[in-house]
Interface confidence: low
C-alpha cells in the first residue's frame, strides 16, 4: 500500500516569495509522484517545480497559485494510486492602482457644493489600510468636510468646495507591505476669489556675491495679496527689509531679487498668496549657496601594455553637482577612442607605453574648480643588464651573485636557493640593484641559485651554480687542553678538510719523536697505556699541496681520575643541633670540593656563621632549622674531571620524653646527637 509520510498542509504565503508544499510517500514498489491543482496536473516551470516529491515555489503568484493542490502517488505496475489531503495557500499581497473618480460619473459634472467620491484602486490581502493625501499632505477623518477611513478605499468630499482642489493620491499598507497610487487624480474646483498659483518659485543655487531671483505670481478676483517671508518668518518688503536682507528687492510682478548673496542669505523663502476668500497659498523655494569640496588624492597607478584599465574620478561633494572631465597634457579627453572619458572614468584601452604620464581629473561648478593628478606608469617586462654567473666562492668570505635588470617601474628581485625563497637574514642580503650577498660563505652554500626580476608586466629569471672553495681547517678543531687517565688506554683524535684531502700527523711540541707505545694512526694519537711522561704539549699538523699546512696545539695532562674516599650519608638531626656531612675525595691533580645545597652552590666566602666547609671537604651546619632540610651534593673536581655524590638531610623536632622512658632511651631513628 502507498502511505503518505508527509502530507501538504495549507499555509500562509507571501506574493513573490518562496514556498514549499511537502509530500513524502512510502511504498513497496517504485511509485511516481505528481501534483494536481484544482484537479489538473501541475507542469514544472522555473517558478513552480517538483523538488523530489515536494512542490517548490520560487515565487508565489496569487493568480496562478490560488486553488487546491493535491499530491498524487501512483504505482505504474499495479495501477494503485493514493492522493494526499488538499492544501491551499493564504496568499498575502498588495498591488498598486490608480485614484479614480467614483462620483459624479465624469469630471465635467464636478461643481462647487456637489459631493465628490474618489476611489483608491490599491488592493491586497489581507485588506490593506488606506491613507489619502492632498498635495502630499495626509488627510484624516474629521477634517474640513471629508470622510476618510484608513482601511476604506473611498474618500468622500461633501460638499466639495474650492478649498478641496488639489492632487489626490493614496497609499495603502498591510502586513505584506506598502503601495502608493500608480496614477493620481487632480481635483479642480474653481472659486475666482481664491488665490491660484500662476508661477511658483523654484529652488536656486548661486555663487557667493552673485544675484538670485525668485519668481512668484498668483491670480484671483479681486487680485490677491502677495508677501515674501524668509526662514525666521521675517517679512521682506521694499520698505522693511531684515538687516541680513538689505539687498532684497520685491518687484511689482511678485519676483524677489537678492543681490550680492552671502552665506547668511541661504535658506527657505516663502511666497504667500492670499485671495479674498480661501486659505493662503504658501509656496516655498530654497536658496542654496554653491559650494565645492576638495578632491581626494589619487594613488599612482601601474598598468601593463595591451591591457584595458579604468581610473574612477570621485567628484568632490558640491552644490550644484560638479561636472567632471579628464585632461592629459592640457587637452580634454574625448568621449570615445582608445583613451577616452566614460562618465567619471578615465578609460585606457589596449594600453601603449606612450600612454604613461600625468592625467588630471577636473571638477567644477558655480563655486569654483578643483583638480587632482594621477600618475600612470606603463609597466615593461624587465631586461637583463647582467645575469648571475656560475661562481667559485671562498669559504668564510663574503660572496656576491649579480642579477642586474632594468624595467619600468623599477623591478622587484627575489632569489631562490635550491628552489626555496631566500629571506633576508644575517647571512643573506639582497641589494637594491638585485645583487645577492652571502655574508660568510659556508660549505653547504654550494648549490643552485636562481634570481627572478618582476614588474606587473612580467618577469625574467636566470640561475647560476655556486661552488664553494673550502678552506683548510680542522673539523672539529682539537680541544687545546685534554686529560688522559693514568695507566689506561687513551686516544686523541684530529681531523681536517680542505680543497684537497689533507694529510694529518702528530708531533711533540718540542720536536721530539713519539715514544714507541704511542702511535699516530691517520690523525688519531693512540696511547696504549698512559704514563706520567706522556703529559706535555703536542701539535696536530694538517697539510695539502694547494693550501699549505695548519697546526693545532694540544696540552695533554695525565691524571688519576677522582674517587670518593668518604661519601656523605643520609642524616637526621634535631632542630637546633649541629649537622655534619662528611665528604673526602682523591685524585691527581688533587681535587677541590664544593657543596651544593638545595639546588645552589654554597659559596665558602658567603656561608655565614652557621655553615662551614672544612679543609678535608666536610660540611658542618650549626643550629639547624627545618628549612635546612633537603638534598646536599658534594662535588669533587680537578682540571681533568668532576664527580658528585649526594645525601639528604632531615631536620626534626626533638621529642618530649615520656615518663616511662629513661634518660638513656635511644631515639626512634638513626641520628647525630651533639
Amino acid at each position: 500500500a502507498i502511505v503518505f509520510i508527509k502530507q501538504p498542509s495549507s499555509q500562509d504565503a507571501l506574493q513573490g516569495r518562496r514556498a514549499l508544499l511537502r509530500c513524502e510517500v512510502e511504498a513497496p514498489g517504485p511509485v511516481h509522484v505528481y501534483w494536481l491543482l484544482d484537479g489538473a496536473p501541475v507542469q514544472d516551470t522555473e517558478r513552480r517545480f517538483a523538488q523530489g516529491s515536494s512542490l517548490s515555489f520560487a515565487a508565489v503568484d496569487r493568480l496562478q497559485d490560488s486553488g487546491t493542490f493535491q499530491c498524487v502517488a501512483r504505482d505504474d505496475v499495479t495501477g494503485e494510486e493514493a492522493r494526499s489531503a488538499n492544501a491551499s495557500f493564504n496568499i498575502k499581497w498588495i498591488e498598486a492602482g490608480p485614484v479614480v473618480l467614483k462620483h459624479p460619473a465624469s469630471e465635467a459634472e464636478i461643481q462647487p457644493q456637489t459631493q465628490v467620491t474618489l476611489r483608491c484602486h490599491i488592493d491586497g490581502h489581507p485588506r490593506p489600510t488606506y491613507q489619502w493625501f492632498r498635495d502630499g499632505t495626509p488627510l484624516s477623518d474629521g477634517q474640513s468636510n471629508h470622510t476618510v477611513s484608513s482601511k476604506e478605499r473611498n474618500l468622500t468630499l461633501r460638499p466639495a468646495g474650492p478649498e478641496h482642489s488639489g492632487l489626490y493620491s493614496c497609499c495603502a499598507h498591510s502586513a505584506f507591505g506598502q503601495a502608493c497610487s500608480s496614477q493620481n487624480f487632480t481635483l479642480s474646483i474653481a472659486d475666482e476669489s481664491f488665490a491660484r498659483v500662476v508661477l511658483a518659485p523654484q529652488d536656486v543655487v548661486v555663487a557667493r556675491y552673485e544675484e538670485a531671483m525668485f519668481h512668484c505670481q498668483f491670480s484671483a478676483q479681486p487680485p490677491p495679496s502677495l508677501q515674501w517671508l524668509f526662514e525666521d518668518e521675517t517679512p521682506i518688503t521694499n520698505r522693511s527689509r531684515p538687516p541680513h536682507l538689505r539687498r532684497a528687492t520685491v518687484f511689482a510682478n511678485g519676483s524677489l531679487l537678492l543681490t550680492q548673496v552671502r552665506p547668511r542669505n541661504a535658506g527657505i523663502y516663502r511666497c504667500i498668496g492670499q485671495g479674498q476668500r480661501g486659505p493662503p497659498i504658501i509656496l516655498e523655494a530654497t536658496l542654496h549657496l554653491a559650494e565645492i569640496e576638495d578632491m581626494p588624492l589619487f594613488e599612482p597607478r601601474v598598468f601593463t601594455a595591451g591591457s584595458e584599465e579604468r581610473v574612477t574620478c570621485l567628484p568632490p561633494k558640491g552644490l550644484p553637482e560638479p561636472s567632471v572631465w579628464w585632461e592629459h597634457a592640457g587637452v580634454r579627453l574625448p568621449t570615445h577612442g582608445r583613451v577616452y572619458q566614460k562618465g567619471h572614468e578615465l578609460v585606457l584601452a589596449n594600453i601603449a607605453e606612450s600612454d604613461a604620464g600625468v592625467y588630471t581629473c577636473h571638477a567644477a561648478n558655480l563655486a569654483g574648480q578643483r583638480r587632482q593628478d594621477v600618475n600612470i606608469t606603463v609597466a615593461t617586462v624587465p631586461s637583463w643588464l647582467k645575469k648571475p654567473q656560475d661562481s667559485q666562492l671562498e669559504e668564510g668570505k663574503p660572496g656576491y651573485l649579480d642579477c642586474l635588470t632594468q624595467a619600468t617601474p623599477k623591478p622587484t628581485v627575489v632569489w631562490y636557493r635550491n628552489q626555496m625563497l631566500i629571506s633576508e637574514d644575517s647571512r643573506f642580503e639582497v641589494f637594491k640593484n638585485g645583487t645577492l650577498r652571502i655574508n660568510s660563505v659556508e660549505v653547504y652554500d654550494g648549490t643552485w641559485y636562481r634570481c627572478m626580476s618582476s614588474t606587473p608586466a612580467g618577469s625574467i629569471e636566470a640561475q647560476a651554480r655556486v661552488q664553494v672553495l673550502e678552506k683548510l681547517k680542522f673539523t672539529p678543531p682539537p680541544q687545546p687542553q685534554q686529560c688522559m687517565e693514568f695507566d689506561k688506554e687513551a686516544t686523541v683524535p684530529c681531523s681536517a678538510t680542505g680543497r684537497e684531502k689533507p694529510t694529518i700527523k702528530w708531533e711533540r711540541a718540542d720536536g721530539s719523536s713519539l715514544p714507541e707505545w704511542v702511535t699516530d694512526n691517520a690523525g688519531t694519537l693512540h696511547f696504549a697505556r698512559v704514563t706520567r711522561d706522556d703529559a706535555g704539549n703536542y701539535t696536530c699538523i694538517a697539510s695539502n699541496g694547494p693550501q699549505g699546512q695548519i697546526r693545532a696545539h694540544v696540552q695533554l695532562t695525565v691524571a688519576v681520575f677522582i674517587t670518593f674516599k668518604v661519601e656523605p650519608e643520609r642524616t637526621t638531626v634535631y632542630q637546633g643541633h649541629t649537622a655534619l656531612l662528611q665528604c673526602e675525595a682523591q685524585g691527581d691533580p688533587k681535587p677541590l670540593i664544593q657543596w651544593k645545597g638545595k639546588d645552589r652552590i654554597l659559596d665558602p666566602t658567603k656561608l655565614g656563621p652557621r655553615m662551614h666547609i672544612f679543609q678535608n671537604g666536610s660540611l658542618v651546619i650549626h643550629d639547624v632549622a627545618p628549612e635546612d632540610s633537603g638534598r646536599y651534593t658534594c662535588i669533587a673536581g680537578n682540571s681533568c674531571n668532576i664527580k658528585h655524590t649526594e645525601a639528604p638531610l632531615y631536620v626534626v623536632d626533638k621529642p618530649v620524653p615520656e615518663e616511662s622512658e629513661g634518660p638513656g632511651s635511644p631515639p626512634p631513628y638513626k641520628m647525630i646527637q651533639t
Epitope: 489600510t129 477623518d141 499598507h173 502586513a175 505584506f176
Partner: antibody, heavy 119, light 113 residues
Framework: EVQLVESGGGLVQPGGSLRLSCTAS????????VIWVRQAPGKGLEWVGI???????YYANWAKGRFTISRDTSKNTVYLQMNSLRAEDTAVYFC?????????????WGQGTLVTVSS | EIVMTQSPSTLSASVGDRVIITCQAS????????LAWYQQKPGKAPKLLIY???KLASGVPSRFSGSGSGAEFTLTISSLQPDDFATYYC?????????????FGQGTKLTVL
C-alpha cells in the same frame, strides 16, 4: 544573539523631555515594524506607538502630539522622544520588534527602561 | 477606542489544572487571526506564547494552545505547571483607522490556589 536594548530612562521633572533609545543587535531593525509599549507600576501593558518599515508612524490617541518615534537605520536604533511629561507617564518603557513582515504582533521585547516623572 | 476585554482578571488554580483565559475585542481584528498571547513575570519583559491566534511560538511547551477568530479568542493551559504562575496578556492588531493599531487586554493574573 538577537536582542533589543533600551536606554535613556531616568528621573525627569513634570513638563520635561526625555529621549529613549532602542538599539538592536543580531538583526537589522529596518526590516521590522518597531513598537513602543509601556507599563505603569503594578498596571498592565499599554501600546504607545508603532513605526513601520516604510517610515509611517501611528500613535495611541493619548500619545499624539507629545510622543514622537524616529529611526536611525545606520545605527540600527529607534528612538522615542517624549515631551511635556506628566506624573502619569511614569512607567517601564519597552521597545519591541514586530513578529514578521506580515504581522504587527510583537515577537521580541527589550528588557525595558524605567522613566520616573516627579518633582 | 478599541477595547480588549480579558477574563477573568485573576484566576487561582493548582498544579495539574486545566486553565482557560478568554480575550474579546470590541471590533474585528485586522486579519481575523492577528492576535498574540504573552506571559509576564514580575520585573521581566513579556514572553511570546502564541501568535496568529493558534500558532505556538518557538520553545513554548505544547501544554499552551490558542484558538479563536474575528473578535473572540481563548488561551488554554492543559495541565498547569509550577512555572506557569504569572500574568497573561492578549494583544490584537487592528486597522489603525481609529488611531488604534494594537491593543492589549488588561491582563489575567494566575495565582496558586
Amino acid at each position: 544573539e538577537v536582542q533589543l536594548v533600551e536606554s535613556g530612562g531616568g528621573l525627569v521633572q513634570p513638563g520635561g523631555s526625555l529621549r529613549l533609545s532602542c538599539t538592536a543587535s543580531g538583526i537589522d531593525l529596518s526590516n521590522y515594524a518597531v513598537i513602543w509599549v509601556r507599563q505603569a507600576p503594578g498596571k498592565g501593558l499599554e501600546w504607545v506607538g508603532i513605526h513601520y518599515t516604510y517610515d509611517t508612524t501611528y500613535y495611541a490617541n493619548w500619545a499624539k502630539g507629545r510622543f514622537t518615534i524616529s529611526r536611525d537605520t545606520s545605527k540600527n536604533t529607534v528612538y522615542l522622544q517624549m515631551n511635556s511629561l506628566r506624573a502619569e507617564d511614569t512607567a517601564v518603557y519597552f521597545c519591541a520588534r514586530s513578529f514578521s513582515d506580515i504581522s504587527d504582533l510583537i515577537k521580541l521585547w527589550g528588557q525595558g527602561t524605567l522613566v520616573t516623572v516627579s518633582s | 477606542e478599541i477595547v480588549m476585554t480579558q477574563s477573568p482578571s485573576t484566576l487561582s488554580a493548582s498544579v495539574g489544572d486545566r486553565v482557560i483565559i478568554t480575550c474579546q475585542a470590541s471590533q474585528s481584528l485586522y486579519n481575523n487571526k492577528d492576535l498574540a498571547w504573552y506571559q509576564q513575570k514580575p520585573g521581566k519583559a513579556p514572553k511570546l506564547l502564541i501568535y496568529e491566534a493558534s500558532k505556538l511560538a518557538s520553545g513554548v511547551p505544547s501544554r499552551f494552545s490558542g484558538s479563536g477568530s474575528g473578535a473572540e479568542f481563548t488561551l488554554t493551559i492543559s495541565s498547569l505547571q509550577p512555572d506557569d504562575f504569572a500574568t497573561y496578556y492578549c494583544l490584537g492588531e487592528f486597522s489603525c483607522g481609529s488611531g488604534d493599531c494594537l491593543a492589549f487586554g488588561q491582563g489575567t493574573k494566575l495565582t496558586v490556589l
